[in-house]
Each structure stands twice: as structure tokens, then as C-alpha cells.
Interface confidence: low
């Protein structure tokens, strides 16, 4: 058993038929010595007496609120939640898998820049009872400071029969150098609470391999004269690392017609600008990517070519 | 020439040497996302190589202040790089195919370190720590796990030279 | 290794006056130098850089009233049209946020008509 | 431009004591700040650079602490030659700012 928050504790339990489970004492916070009764959740009946309550939890029907009680006042309460282990395996119940970039990924990050600061997400069809509380470091064995928010709702989704919520955080890194080549791994631990299941979820990474730019902006197309060729310009999004001359992009630039089937043409530029031959009805899209280290491409930037 | 008396280095064409290391790192190991090689065991065999940290001046203010700093812990990375490459970890068994880009990687890293640091002048290398593996299979992890490594650390110096080619070459 | 300023004096307002910054025993392409600037009796107050490629950057508040411009073993401050308000002690140094920083000993300005 | 709030503007301490200053940058400065002390008619001299390194030939009663965007330079054991102003200075790659200083008086 260990101690998650103030008067909240979390007892592991190997998960199987006929598990012994784990002997829990509970001790009332109180000076008082004599008199005291025990309750579980909004429970009338008293589950024990005395300043102390041994109790063996094998299910979820022996986790729950215990509260200790002398003449009518409550003393102290204890919430105990069970962390279940299956196989040698801790349940991953509350999360769905994303099962992206592979099996087994239930958070999933991204960075836009190189400045410490990234967005971490996760999936659930749990609609209540549900709370995340994230914590982030750089390293675990002396690990500096991430500074994370508070995990909020940030997507419904309808999924055949199933509505699928979507859960994001902010993080940022305190001491954040983003010159420097990563040697110690970002960990984010998200601690998550369904009713009276306790779950933990981790990632780690480096930010570098997470970084997605934001598409180009002022996408912009130039005709040239007699000529069926555009001069395609475009910027740095404003939210990539500066100054560019030092966070450098590449960038893809796609002639798409209008029916997926038609061959796109690809022109790969470290420039910001390309010149490109407009074909009728098609359009034309961008996007960056980091020029020294092969992270995700940013979504497209497009314009018609009308 | 980044020479350690403090003359700059020939930042263009250093720009264009480690530009093309980034492309090489990355054609010899493309595979990212495919294996998170920070699960596999064995942590001891890349911990030990020389990363440019936040203190070495390779920020663009650091580099503005005195580029030396930063150049020297370069450089010290590239011998490190080029030694591993050109070590049995790379040269023993599974043999490398032969038009594998490992070979041009390791020439562009000597190719490199020289044009930082010129017959003659001698900045002080890190020792390259004794690495041989007995299994196949234990070489080819670290060959993954030094090639992520590298990718990482030659994209701070392309970050690095392409910054200093465009605001501090003369 | 060291930095001295010189060419502080009294000037009259509006008559444009030039600081020079000398070093000697490192190279001025390996650093950057920064001028600082101290009134009478008042705290410290940044000018402005000139870095390793010879950009000058300046704090908003010195744009268009000061130039910063480097030689092979100098670094020239002009004060273009000076006020009575940038009387004071003018420093220069290397390296601000480095280990091996050097500061001159400043040069006293003094602007009076 | 980064603006570098310093405080306290004046402070006093026994010999044996601590002081602490604090700067709180106007936005990320990451570790590029230095700490300077400067005595009446002396050049300013240097004591911490990049947030915590102790410049060379400073006593390591100077500690220089960072966190987020507030960095705090403690004197643990203040001795008399510790009276003096004290200023931080802060940049963002390009732009630099000091703080308003910190009279520190010894008593």
C-alpha cells in the first residue's frame, strides 16, 4: 500500500481467482484513543471499532472511503483504491490503446518547437468518475522539472456505438535548452482514477523525436508571366523555434489534382519558396519538416491553384 | 579553420559537410518509431558518449559570445562518432552490406573533425569507451542504438554551422 | 587579456561623440562586446552587442541614438546626439555571459552646455 | 525586450547571514543570466554566469539558483567585503537587460 495524496492510498493486488490479496491497517487520525467505529463509503453499518481497522482487500468491494467516527463526528477518512496486476501485467483498463506509432501506446505526444513545451494526449470511452493527474520530469534518476497543467476534455468523438473522449496536457520543460542535444529522456507519468481503479500510464522520449511543426503560413501563389509556372511562397509557421537561421526547416511542396488517383508532383525545397507547374483544378500544399533531424512532417498548408 | 587558437572555423562548408552527415546518419538508420531502442537492456553502451549540452555555448548567444566552447565539444563528438564507426561494433560480424551508407558516414565524420581542427593542433578527444560485443545480435542493437545517437548529435552541429554560416561568417 | 575604453569627455548636447573599446591579448572575432552604460549614482544599463559576424544589437530604448561598429582590435560606441541624460560611465566587456568575461575600467562621458 | 525585475532593491545582513536575490525574467531566458557585483567606483564583477556557474576566483558563498523564469543568487556565510550593488542581467539571444539592483549593506 502506498499513500497517492493526502488520505488517499493505493493497494496492489495480483489480480487472480482466489488471491489472498493484501492485509490494509488503518489507523484513525486522532488523539482520541477509545470510542471510535469505523464506516465504509456512506455505509450505516460499522465495519470495526478502536483507534485501529485491519482489513483484508481482495475486490473492489473492499476499496472505497473508510471513515472513523466517535459520537456522531467523523475523525479522519481514508480512501483506499486497488492498482490491479494480471499476469505480471498492471491493468491498462481506463485507456485505449492508440496503437500509434505501435501496440501498447496509450499516450501520445507531440512538440511544435524545440522550447521545452508539449502537448500530451489520450483516449477513454469512460464518460464519469474519471480523474488524470499528470507529473513530468526530464530523466528518473535525478530528474529536472516539467511543469504540467491539468489534464482536460479536449475532444468528443462518436465511434460506431461508442463515444470516444479525448484528454490533453501542457507541459513545459523549467529549464528547458533547446540548443542542446537531449541526452535524458522526458518521462510523463499520468496517474489515472476511475471510481476505485487506480492506473498508471508513462512515455518517455526525447522531444526531438516528437516534434511536429505547424504547417507553413501566408501560403501565397505568384503567376509567371507566359508561363504555366507559379512561384509558390510560403513562411516559417510562427510557432517553430527562431532564429531560423539555427532551427531550420525543409519543406515538401505537392501538385495534387482533384481526384486522389492523379499523380502528385513533389518538389522537396529548404527554400520558401519553389516554382511549380498549376495544373487546372488542382492545388497546391506545403509542409515543413525539421532540415537536420527526421521528425513528423507538419499537416499540409494548401491554396487552389485557380 | 576552427583552429584552437580561435580563428572561425570555414562555417559554408562546414554547413554543407554536416548537412550531408544528417542525410547519411538517417539513410543508414531510418527506422524510426520501428524499435524504441531506450527499452532494449544495456544502457551502459551509449551513456558514455559525448552529447552537447547546455553549457557548451551551442546556442545561437553562445555562439555569438565565443564559438570555441562549442566548436571544441563538436569536434570532440566527431573523433568519438568516427572512431565507433570505424571500431569492430561496425566492422564485425553482421558485415555491413556494401553499398551501406555507414562507409561514407565514417568518412564524412573524418572529413568533418578536419576541417575543424587542422593537422597539427590538437584539442583534447574523450577516450572511446571499450565496447565489444560477443553476440551478433548484441552489435547490431548498438550499431542502432550509436546510429540514433549520432542522428541526434549531428543535427545540433548542422544546427549549429548552418546558424554560423549565415550570421557569423565573415 | 584585457579592455579599455577611452574618449569619455565633456561634451556639449547634440555634438555627436565617439567611444573607442581596445582589446588586446584575444581576438575580437571569438567574442562578442557589449557596452554598458552607468549614470551617477544609478544601477547599470545595457547599450548594446556586437557579435562574432560584426551584427549590432541594440535595447529598444538606445535604438537610433547609438552605433555600435567593430575594427580588427577595437569596438567604437557612437553616442549620435547626446543629451544631458547620457552623462555617465560607459563600460565595455567581453562576453557577458560567459566564464572568461572581462569588464574595461569605463570611461566617464559628461554631457553639459 | 526581456525585462528583468530585480528585487529586493536594497537588503541588509549580519556577518555569518544569508541573502538572497531574486530576478524574475519577463519571459524564457533558458540559463543565460549573469550576476554581477559592483563597489563604488569599480567596474562591475562578474560572480555568476549562465544562471548558476560560479565565475572563476568567486568564493562559493555565491550560489546562483534558476527556476522557470526566476533566478535567485544566494550569499550563504555574508562577509563584509560582501557590501556592495549587486545586478542581474538577462538576455534572449540577441537583447540583453540588467535588473534595477540590490544594495546589499553588511552590518
Known amino acids: 500500500i502506498w499513500e497517492l495524496k493526502k488520505d488517499v492510498y493505493v493497494v496492489e493486488l495480483d489480480w487472480y481467482p482466489d488471491a489472498p490479496g493484501e492485509m490494509v491497517v488503518l489507523t484513525c487520525d486522532t488523539p482520541e484513543e477509545d470510542g471510535i467505529t469505523w464506516t465504509l463509503d456512506q455505509s450505516s453499518e460499522v465495519l470495526g471499532s478502536g483507534k485501529t481497522l485491519t482489513i483484508q482487500v481482495k475486490e473492489f468491494g473492499d476499496a472505497g472511503q473508510y471513515t472513523c467516527h466517535k459520537g456522531g463526528e467523523v475523525l479522519s477518512h481514508s480512501l483506499l483504491l486497488l492498482h490491479k496486476k494480471e499476469d505480471g501485467i498492471w491493468s491498462t483498463d481506463i485507456l485505449k490503446d492508440q496503437k500509434e506509432p505501435k501496440n501498447k501506446t496509450f499516450l501520445r505526444c507531440e512538440a511544435k518547437n524545440y522550447s521545452g513545451r508539449f502537448t500530451c494526449w489520450w483516449l477513454t470511452t469512460i464518460s464519469t468518475d474519471l480523474t488524470f493527474s499528470v507529473k513530468s520530469s526530464r530523466g528518473s534518476s535525478d530528474p529536472q522539472g516539467v511543469t504540467c497543467g491539468a489534464a482536460t476534455l479536449s475532444a468528443e468523438r462518436v465511434r460506431g456505438d461508442n463515444k470516444e473522449y479525448e484528454y490533453s496536457v501542457e507541459c513545459q520543460e523549467d529549464s528547458a535548452c533547446p540548443a542542446a542535444e537531449e541526452s535524458l529522456p522526458i518521462e510523463v507519468m499520468v496517474d489515472a482514477v476511475h471510481k476505485l481503479k487506480y492506473e498508471n500510464y508513462t512515455s518517455s522520449f526525447f522531444i526531438r523525436d516528437i516534434i511536429k511543426p505547424d504547417p507553413p503560413k501566408n501560403l501565397q501563389l505568384k503567376p509567371l508571366k507566359n508561363s504555366r509556372q507559379v512561384e509558390v511562397s510560403w513562411e516559417y509557421p510562427d510557432t517553430w523555434s527562431t532564429p531560423h537561421s539555427y532551427f531550420s526547416l525543409t519543406f515538401c511542396v505537392q501538385v495534387q489534382g482533384k481526384s486522389k488517383r492523379e499523380k502528385k508532383d513533389r518538389v522537396f525545397t529548404d527554400k520558401t519558396s519553389a516554382t511549380v507547374i498549376c495544373r487546372k483544378n488542382a492545388s497546391i500544399s506545403v509542409r515543413a519538416q525539421d532540415r537536420y533531424y527526421s521528425s513528423s512532417w507538419s499537416e499540409w498548408a494548401s491554396v487552389p491553384c485557380s | 579553420r576552427a583552429v584552437p587558437g580561435g580563428s572561425s572555423p570555414a562555417w559554408t562548408q562546414c554547413q554543407q559537410l554536416s548537412q550531408k552527415l544528417c542525410t547519411l546518419a538517417w539513410s543508414a538508420h531510418p527506422l524510426v518509431g520501428h524499435m524504441d531502442l531506450r527499452e532494449e537492456g544495456d544502457e551502459e553502451t551509449t551513456n558514455d558518449v559525448p552529447h552537447i549540452q547546455c553549457g557548451d555555448g551551442c546556442d545561437p548567444q553562445g555562439l555569438r559570445d565565443n564559438s570555441q566552447f562549442c566548436l571544441q565539444r563538436i569536434h570532440q563528438g566527431l573523433i568519438f562518432y568516427e572512431k565507433l564507426l570505424g571500431s569492430d561494433i561496425f566492422t564485425g560480424e553482421p558485415s555491413l552490406l556494401p553499398d551501406s551508407p555507414v562507409g561514407q558516414l565514417h568518412a564524412s565524420l573524418l572529413g568533418l573533425s578536419q576541417l575543424l581542427q587542422p593537422e597539427g593542433h590538437h584539442w583534447e578527444t574523450q577516450q572511446i569507451p571499450s565496447l565489444s560485443p560477443s553476440q551478433p545480435w548484441q552489435r547490431l542493437l548498438l550499431r542502432f542504438k550509436i546510429l540514433r545517437s549520432l542522428q541526434a548529435f549531428v543535427a545540433v552541429a548542422a544546427r549549429v554551422f548552418a546558424h554560423g554560416a549565415a550570421t557569423l561568417s565573415p | 587579456q584585457s579592455v579599455e575604453e577611452s574618449g569619455g569627455r565633456l561634451v556639449t548636447p547634440g555634438t555627436p561623440l565617439t567611444l573607442t573599446c581596445t582589446v588586446s591579448?584575444?581576438?575580437?572575432?571569438?567574442?562578442?562586446m557589449s557596452w554598458v552604460r552607468q549614470a551617477p549614482g544609478k544601477g547599470l544599463e545595457w547599450i548594446g552587442v556586437?557579435?562574432?559576424?560584426?551584427s549590432a544589437y541594440y535595447a529598444s530604448w538606445a535604438k537610433g541614438r547609438f552605433t555600435i561598429s567593430g575594427a580588427s582590435t577595437t569596438v567604437d560606441l557612437k553616442i549620435t546626439s547626446p543629451t544631458t541624460e547620457d552623462t555617465a560611465t560607459y563600460f565595455c566587456a567581453r562576453a557577458t555571459y560567459s566564464d572568461d568575461n572581462i569588464w574595461g575600467p569605463g570611461t566617464l562621458v559628461t554631457v553639459s552646455s | 525586450d526581456v525585462v528583468m525585475t530585480q528585487t529586493p532593491s536594497s537588503t541588509s545582513a549580519a556577518v555569518g547571514g544569508t541573502v538572497t536575490i531574486k530576478c524574475q525574467a519577463s519571459?524564457?531566458?533558458?540559463?543565460?543570466l549573469s550576476w554581477y557585483q559592483q563597489k563604488p567606483g569599480q567596474r562591475p564583477k562578474p560572480l555568476i554566469v549562465r544562471a548558476s556557474t560560479l565565475a572563476s576566483g568567486v568564493p562559493s558563498r555565491f550560489k546562483g539558483n534558476r527556476s522557470g523564469t526566476e533566478y535567485t543568487l544566494t550569499i550563504s556565510g555574508v562577509q563584509r567585503e560582501d557590501a556592495a550593488a549587486y545586478y542581474c542581467l538577462g538576455g534572449d539571444g540577441n537583447v540583453s537587460n540588467f535588473g534595477g539592483g540590490t544594495k546589499v549593506v553588511v552590518v
Open positions: 556586437i557579435g562574432l559576424g560584426g
Open positions: 591579448g584575444f581576438s575580437l572575432n571569438s567574442y562578442s
Open positions: 519571459q524564457s531566458i533558458s540559463s543565460w
